[in-house]
Each structure stands twice: as C-alpha cells, then as structure tokens.
Interface confidence: medium
C-alpha cells in the first residue's frame, strides 16, 4: 500500500536524482509523525529509498506506478 | 577515506577501442553509482555515464550510446569503461567518480554529500594515427 | 556547447568577493535538482567545493558558498586567496537527457 504506518521509519535525507523507473516497484508515504515528508520508492531489489515528494520527477514516479 | 585508483596512459589509433578501469578502495557498495567523465584537452567536463549497482542497471548519456560500455567487477572491486570507434576527438581525460545514491529511511550518519564526490586521478586517452 | 553557461573567466584581488553565475534550463535547475559546484586546481582531478546548492563537504572553508534561485545557481568566493586560482565547474541531473550536465567552467584569476 502507498500509504503509510506508524510503524515505517522516517527519511533524514533524500535521493537527489531520479533512479530509472523501470526498476522501481512500489512506492510509500513515510509516517505524519516524521519529521520530513517523504516518499520510500522500493527497488526491484527490495531496497527503500528515500525521495522528497515536492520534487516533479518525484511525484511523476508515483503517478506512474500508480497507473501500473 | 575512499579511493578510486585508475589504469594508466593509454594510445590508440582512430578505430580502436580503449578499456580503462577503476578500482574502488572501499569495494563496489550499492549505496553508491560510479560514473565516467571525461575532459579534452582545455574543455569542461562531460558525463557519459554511471553503473548503479543499486538498481543493478547501467545508464549512459545520449551521444555515447552504442559505442560505450561500463561494466563492473564486484569481486575485483574495479570499474571499466570501453569506448569503441575512437576518433581523435575522443581524446581526453578520463575520471571516475562516485555518487551516493542509496538513501533509506532511518539514521543518515553514514551519508555523505550529494554530488560527485569522490574522483580517480584520470586516464589521458589519446587517440592519434 | 554546455547544457550549463558559466562566465569563461572571473578575476579578483586576494581578499575580494568574487561571484560565478551558472544559468540552466526548465529541464535541470529549473525543475528542482540540486546544484553542485566542483573546484579544479591545475592539473588535478576536480573535487566537490558544494553540494545540494549550498552545503560544503568537511574540509571546505566557509569563504565558499552556493545559492540558486529559478533557473540559475551562483557560487561565491569570499576573502580571495591565491590557492584559489582554478577552474570552477557547475553541474546538475538534467530530465532531458536523463544524466549529469555541467557547465563550461569558469577559470578564477587571483590578481
């Protein structure tokens, strides 16, 4: 699910630049509580990445797998 | 601290290809892409294109597709970069350089600076007949 | 021709302000992505001097800052010292064509 819990760690730091979205599978929000907003995109690898969701390629990213 | 330690001088004729490598003191981690830039002689500086390991994939800059290859050796810890069909306009410095790209959620004492931030010495590649 | 346009040269006296420009497009400092500024001293591999617009990397005096604003970025050099005689090169992701750019760089001159 895109949407968070309160159980998800919370993102200090983002990813400065996009990685390709063919290799990003599932994405969601971190929790209200923290401190900075953020997006997890989790790679076909399984690895969470942080993304800061003002961010235009950012927010195309989850259009995109949210039409997928 | 990290280093990135690369092949020597290389020269080659127009046609040829080259091969310059990298070795990654700290070995090949996820939480970083390794890119190849280069820089002719007085020029400025051009990306042509980066392994990210995280990801598993391998991305290049538009004007070196189809003649340029980066591969990476976990078990060497080394970085390669072939270019093919050389001209003499191919002649230049070659660098790698890191660039962290794994951010996760949770503590980032561990992070470093956005950006390329750690760079070889370079390879001069000369392409001449 | 550089996807980033930097001033060729710049000059100043030891203790002077100087500033360089580095003007992009929608595609790149427009669009959000961070500006990092990289130092280059005579023949030598270039090093990151800031990243993420405005943050220096341990090791960097505070003399060095960075801003952007729009489609623009611009890095200063305050109480000019002669080590900082180099080129100065702008660089950032560009959604365009999907990779780093930079710009042509800039050769500082400490008169």
């Known amino acids: 699910s895109p949407y968070s819990s309160d159980t998800t760690p919370c993102c200090f730091a983002y990813i400065a630049r996009p990685l390709p979205r063919a290799h990003i599978k599932e994405y969601f929000y971190t929790s209200g509580k923290c401190s900075n907003p953020a997006v997890v995109f989790v790679t076909r690898k399984n690895r969470q990445v942080c993304a800061n969701p003002e961010k235009k390629w950012v927010r195309e990213y989850i259009n995109s797998l949210e039409m997928s | 601290q990290v280093q990135l330690v690369q092949s020597g001088a290389e020269v080659k004729k127009p046609g040829s290809s080259v091969k310059v490598s990298c070795k990654i003191s700290g070995g090949i981690s996820d939480n970083y892409a390794l890119s190849w830039v280069r820089q002719a002689p007085g020029q400025g500086l051009e990306w042509m294109g980066a392994v990210i390991p995280l990801v598993e994939t391998t991305s290049y800059a538009q004007r070196f597709q189809g003649r340029l290859t980066i591969t990476a050796d976990d078990s060497l810890n080394t970085l390669y970069m072939e270019l093919g069909s050389l001209r003499s306009d191919d002649t230049a410095m070659y660098y790698c350089a890191r660039e962290q790209v794994a951010v996760g959620p949770g503590p980032t004492s561990n992070r470093g600076p956005d950006g390329l931030d750690v760079w070889g010495r370079g390879t001069m590649v000369t392409v001449s007949s | 021709q550089s996807v980033l346009t930097q001033p060729p040269s710049v000059s100043g006296a030891p203790g002077q302000r100087v500033t360089i420009s580095c003007t992009g497009s929608?595609?790149?400092?427009?669009?959000?992505?961070?500006v990092h500024w990289y130092q280059q001293l005579p023949g030598t591999a270039p090093k990151l001097l800031i990243y993420?617009?405005?943050n220096r990397p341990s090791g960097v005096p505070d003399r060095f800052s960075g801003s952007t604003s729009g489609t623009s970025a611009s890095l200063a050099i305050r109480g000019l010292q002669s080590e900082d005689e180099a080129d100065y090169y702008c660089g950032t992701w560009d959604d365009i064509l999907n990779g780093w750019v930079f710009g042509g760089g800039t050769k500082l001159t400490v008169l």
């Open positions: 929608s595609s790149n400092i427009g669009d959000g992505y961070d």
């Open positions: 993420g617009n405005s």
